[in-house]
């Protein structure tokens, strides 16, 4: 008896481990505008906050300015990068912005970078108007592994807006790799 | 015998309870148009709508214009606002707009309200087009505690797609909070 | 004892089958670009990949260019849409551009077809630029029944961008209909 | 690569107004930040403003604000200056410069600038 009731209960561990909902890796990471590149070309976003105020992380690893996976599943991935502008923050080089950001994984054992989603606009802001402000949400459902890193690229990371509820990105796990 | 088949069943009773995918809450609302406020400044939209076409609810609340969480753990929260302007309308007071959408939650136990996320543009709708559009979506994974309250704020509600499918906001638990 | 184990072991099973993370439908299609219809009016683009780069399907059918459920339940769906035009490729007919996308959803019991969720913007594309670019992200939760089907309908087809990271829709389930 | 030729430099009195051009030629003028800098005699080169690629936004030195302003027409290829309430120590010969946007804001350095034209000479005296 004892035997058969260790092995219902280790089945049941086993699906508890597998199936618990508390056990899903996930991350929502916020800007840390204390060092945002310069520039209007393309650069990569190193600083992210992932403990404080709505930024946090579970069962993932935030190291180098990317997000590593320690998971092999299915995950949602989601990005919304802010932009804006203020005419007391200085004059603009040119009224034609690409104002863009790139969501992208490396693996690190083939050592490449690949594009999973990208967004954004053409934006003309002109001189005429004292403030301008755009926004970019992404999202999509990725396979990941173990080991794969997400970062974000954007341009002209000199607009971004710094606050927490305004550019950000994350992940969460929906389900197991069959 | 007895004794340890009700341990097992009540540990699969306790697992089932926790991670049964249909326990899930979850809560799609779309706009009520029928009591949109006018002006421009940004306000709180509190007519929505959550038993009637894509509308739905479960295991939350809608009261007073706000989406309750009656049960603590990680979410994923969305919104799509879609604005539209036809000249048969009227002449709008500006050409220069500031389309805006805030998803704010506010506790009840520390009666404060925080911007979890927001997006927008500003726009410039010239009366040289008879007919403008324009349309935000967020989302992000937040942690929610049980009585917590989620609420639309837009700037230009004048201005919303009043259709189902143009303007609304929902939320789907995804975790247990550890 | 064994009758008892064997009930336990029935309901064990039952539970694996429903709440089992790996068990769940989700697809990511992304934009086939080699048949992009043609013309400025709102199409259906019947045109995706299933099982190519970031493109795959599980517990779900592509057929005749729609998205077919197989599983009731409630999903998370989601488009993300992008257009461009470079000074290259021609002369614009109209700078007043209106580009949308339209997530519907059809039922073969009744032969009806149902926006779900709508996104976009009016454009103005001078030719004083010599590219332009706009993308458009939409997302909601759904209920969905076995057989319903999902399909994309786009302004302006020509336009669309037709990178893998750039033009996708997809979804998931999150849990079943009680 | 863009050709830069400036011109409408002179002898003006202090209090006078003067109307600098610079055209430009080879490549696409529109998709150029264009900038005016000056060099006194025995000094380095200053900058003085500079103008985006639309016309719209316009960054001056602190010493010519209200004085001076930087206009173009980018369907005629050409960058003015106008300076008016014009001082001794405005003497310099003014460059105009060019460089495609790779700074979100106007560049203010000499350095962010590739193409130059010859100058002209401004000289301010009674």
């Known amino acids: 008896i004892r035997a058969e009731k260790a092995m219902v209960d280790g089945s049941w561990l086993d699906l508890a481990k597998r199936s618990k909902l508390e056990a899903q890796p996930f991350a929502h990471l916020t800007i840390n505008a204390t060092d945002i590149p310069s520039g209007s070309h393309k650069v990569s976003l190193s600083s992210w906050y992932h403990d404080r105020g709505w930024a946090k992380i579970s069962n993932m690893t935030f190291s180098n300015g990317k997000l590593i996976v320690n998971q092999d599943g299915f995950y949602y991935l989601y990005a919304n990068i802010c932009f804006r502008h203020h005419e007391t923050s200085g004059d603009l080089a040119t009224e034609y912005l690409q104002l863009m950001v790139y969501v992208t994984k490396t693996s690190i054992k083939i050592p490449s970078s690949h594009t999973l989603m990208k967004g954004g606009s053409t934006k003309y802001w002109s001189g005429n108007s004292e403030f301008h402000f755009y926004s970019i949400n992404v999202g999509g459902f990725f396979k990941l592994r173990s080991g794969e890193e997400i970062s974000i690229e954007v341009s002209n990371p000199s607009l971004l807006d710094p606050d927490q509820d305004a550019t950000y990105f994350g992940a969460f796990k929906v389900r197991d790799i069959d | 015998i007895r004794a340890e088949k009700a341990m097992v069943d009540g540990s699969w009773l306790d697992l089932a309870k926790r991670s049964k995918l249909e326990a899930q809450p979850f809560a799609h609302l779309t706009i009520n148009a029928t009591d949109i406020p006018s002006g421009s400044h940004k306000v709180s939209l509190s007519s929505w709508y959550h038993d009637r076409g894509w509308a739905k609810i479960s295991n939350m609340t809608f009261s007073n214009g706000k989406l309750i969480v009656n049960q603590d753990g990680f979410y994923y929260l969305y919104a799509n606002i879609c604005f539209r302007h036809h000249e048969t309308s009227g002449d709008l007071a500006t050409e220069y707009l500031q389309l805006m959408v805030y998803v704010t939650k506010t506790s009840i136990k520390i009666p404060s309200s925080h911007t979890l996320m927001k997006g927008g543009s500003t726009k410039y709708w010239s009366g040289n087009s008879e007919f403008h559009f324009y349309s935000i979506n967020v989302g992000g994974f937040f942690k929610l505690r049980s009585g917590e309250e989620i609420s639309i704020e837009v700037s230009n509600p004048s201005l919303l797609d009043p259709d189902q499918d143009a303007t609304y906001f929902g939320a789907f638990k995804v975790r247990d909070i550890d | 004892i064994r009758a008892e184990k064997a009930m336990v072991d029935g309901s064990w099973l039952d539970l694996a089958k429903r709440s089992k993370l790996e068990a769940q439908p989700f697809a990511h299609l992304t934009i086939n670009a080699t048949d992009i219809p043609s013309g400025s009016h709102k199409v259906s683009l019947s045109s995706w990949y299933h099982d190519r780069g970031w493109a795959k399907i599980s517990n779900m059918t592509f057929s005749n260019g729609k998205l077919i459920v197989n599983q009731d339940g409630f999903y998370y769906l989601y488009a993300n849409i992008c257009f461009r035009h470079h000074e290259t490729s021609g002369d614009l007919a109209t700078e007043y551009l209106q580009l949308m996308v339209y997530v519907t959803k059809t039922s073969i019991k009744i032969p009806s077809s149902h926006t779900l969720m709508k996104g976009g913007s009016t454009k103005y594309w001078s030719g004083n630029s010599e590219f332009h670019f706009y993308s458009i992200n939409v997302g909601g939760f759904f209920k969905l029944r076995s057989g319903e089907e999902i399909s994309i309908e786009v302004s302006n087809p020509s336009l669309l961008d037709p990178d893998q990271d750039a033009t996708y829709f997809g979804a998931f389930k999150v849990r079943d209909i009680d | 690569e863009v050709q830069l030729v400036e011109s409408g430099g002179g002898l003006v009195q202090p209090g006078g107004s003067l109307r600098l051009s610079c055209a430009a030629a080879?490549?696409?003028?529109?998709?150029?930040?264009m900038g005016w800098f000056r060099q006194a005699p025995g000094k380095g080169r200053e900058f003085v403003t500079a103008?985006?690629?639309?016309?719209?936004?316009?960054g001056y030195v602190d010493s010519v604000k209200d004085r001076f302003t930087i206009s173009r027409d980018n369907t005629k290829n050409t960058l003015y200056l106008q300076m008016a309430s014009l001082r001794p120590e405005d003497t310099a010969v003014y460059y105009c410069?060019?460089?495609?946007?790779?700074?979100?804001?106007?560049?203010?350095?000499?350095?962010?600038?590739?193409?130059w034209g010859q100058g002209t000479l401004v000289t301010v005296s009674s």
């Open positions: 410069a060019a460089t495609t946007p790779a700074t979100t804001y106007l560049p203010r350095s000499e350095r962010q600038y590739d193409y």
């Open positions: 080879g490549g696409t003028f529109r998709n150029y930040v």
């Open positions: 103008i985006s690629t639309g016309g719209s936004w316009t």
